[in-house]
Amino acid sequence: EEELQVIQPDKSVLVAAGETATLRCTATSLIPVGPIQWFRGAGPGRELIYNQKEGHFPRVTTVSDLTKRNNMDFSIRIGNITPADAGTYYCVKFRKGSPDDVEFKSGAGTELSVRAKPSAPVVSGPAARATPQHTVSFTCESHGFSPRDITLKWFKNGNELSDFQTNVDPVGESVSYSIHSTAKVVLTREDVHSQVICEVAHVTLQGDPLRGTANLSETIRVPPTLEVTQQPVRAENQVNVTCQVRKFYPQRLQLTWLENGNVSRTETASTVTENKDGTYNWMSWLLVNVSAHRDDVKLTCQVEHDGQPAVSKSHDLKVSAHPKEQGSNTAAENTGSNER
């Protein structure tokens, strides 16, 4: 039993960020005369939250009217709670002293815990594109949550991934926390339409996790396959050669025709066709005037895709010269070769 007791009935209070916290405190006596003050923390570094005697505390309101006679309820409300407000709050009775007020009795303290939602997860992929069969890393970050317990999962097209590492910082006590996770994903040729999803579950989200996504279309590069073919003769002394550029992504592609190593024509892929898997096909053709050539012609289709080193495919046209009066045609023979 004591002359005056300061009673803080709540050992702990849990409040969602943005809400108002009510910290309860009553005294068993109004004597001796002196103000009630609220502090966060204990010891010399404690932070004054409210002083009945003086001061301006815009976020704090008293639950009851402290100017009312015989009022022994010194509970306060703190508005717009943020994770930075977490800590132990003490209701402290001071007595008038000479010359300064003297701490008389303290309550046992109320621990304020703040529940704060994690920020929307941000997923980022590699800086440079990668080709199928390569492993690429994706990172996921979310910040500002409390308490520390959190669950993070990775998915690719709805399938959960297992190859990832996650850290929650800081390790010790803090007002709020951040999560950082890195997942490894093996690319396939079919991944243009694929998505990588980072899913974060936290007590503040009430079973409705937050998701961040990354489209593998931003990450993958599918190199083209080339096929050069000779079309049937369309006119005397002319041969139509086509270069089929298949299954490439992204669309950025430049094609150059070379005749015996000399540039004949350069063009940029424009009217492409899109495949179901998101890759593109394109075809270019070259009309060769055989009569202009005395010897065999080596035709090369050279493709530079997405700034990568050029790939090429060649086709040999064998030129057989016959006297005109015999009216013979130029023969063309396909001896294709693939060069890089």
Epitope: E2, L4, I31, V33, R69, R95, K96, F104
Partner: antibody, heavy 114, light 111 residues
């Protein structure tokens, strides 16, 4: 139940130090303060000072230079020392519990005389 | 120091009548919404007995015939109706400022 009992010499010579003891029961001296109050014969009450539960003290400024209040919590006793007494210090001396002065001892009479 | 002036110095009242004692402080004894003024009854050869605390609150065991009122500098103790054993000295006391002080007392006699 709560009780306070003053004790000490009934007669003190002028210029000497008056020493009184207040022995308490029914409450803890770490939880409650104890006041000393005196009443000269046929006159009103005068507050001398208080020792709080934490051992800190506050004194009447008129007597401050001569007064010391101390405590021995293990013996449940509070002590009053008043130095350089004169006939004007003749009074009934009371101890009373806490800032509220809700319980009083019966008082002890101290006469300052040679 | 806060000086407390009680009036009247003495008062004779018939049983069943009302007795009113006033206490005027030289400065306000109000702090934090409360008046730190208290009243005591003292009978000859006895220590003071608390009657009223914080201007208007009855101490436990004190009959409801006793009541207190007032704020800041002006306070009143009322006994209604007076009974024969109410004959005593009555003191007001403040503990709002150091040094704590008592009024000079009012002697109540029963006719």
């Amino acid at each position: 139940q709560v009780q306070l009992q003053e004790s000490g010499p009934g007669l003190v010579k002028p210029s000497q130090t008056l020493s009184l003891t207040c022995t308490v029961s029914g409450f803890s001296l770490t939880g409650y303060g104890v006041n000393w109050i005196r009443q000269p014969p046929g006159k009103g009450l005068e507050w001398i000072g208080i020792i709080w539960g934490d051992g800190s003290t506050d004194y009447n400024s008129a007597l401050k230079s001569r007064v010391t209040i101390s405590v021995d919590t293990s013996k449940n006793q509070v002590f009053l020392k008043l130095s350089s007494v004169t006939a004007a210090d003749t009074a009934v001396y009371y101890c009373a519990r806490a800032g509220k002065m809700d319980y009083w001892g019966q008082g002890t009479t101290v006469t300052v005389s040679s | 120091d806060i000086v407390l002036t009680q009036s009247p110095a003495s008062l004779a009242v018939s049983p069943g009548q009302r007795a009113t004692i006033t206490c005027r402080a030289s400065e306000s004894v109000d702090s934090y919404g409360n008046s730190f003024m208290h009243w005591y009854q003292q009978k000859p050869g006895q220590p003071p007995k608390p009657l009223i605390y914080l201007a208007s609150n009855l101490e436990s065991g004190v009959p409801a015939r006793f009541s207190g009122s007032g704020s800041r500098t002006d306070f009143t103790l009322t006994i209604n109706p007076v009974e024969a054993n109410d004959a005593a000295n009555y003191y007001c006391q403040q503990n709002n400022e150091y040094p704590w002080t008592f009024g000079g007392g009012t002697k109540v006699e029963i006719k």
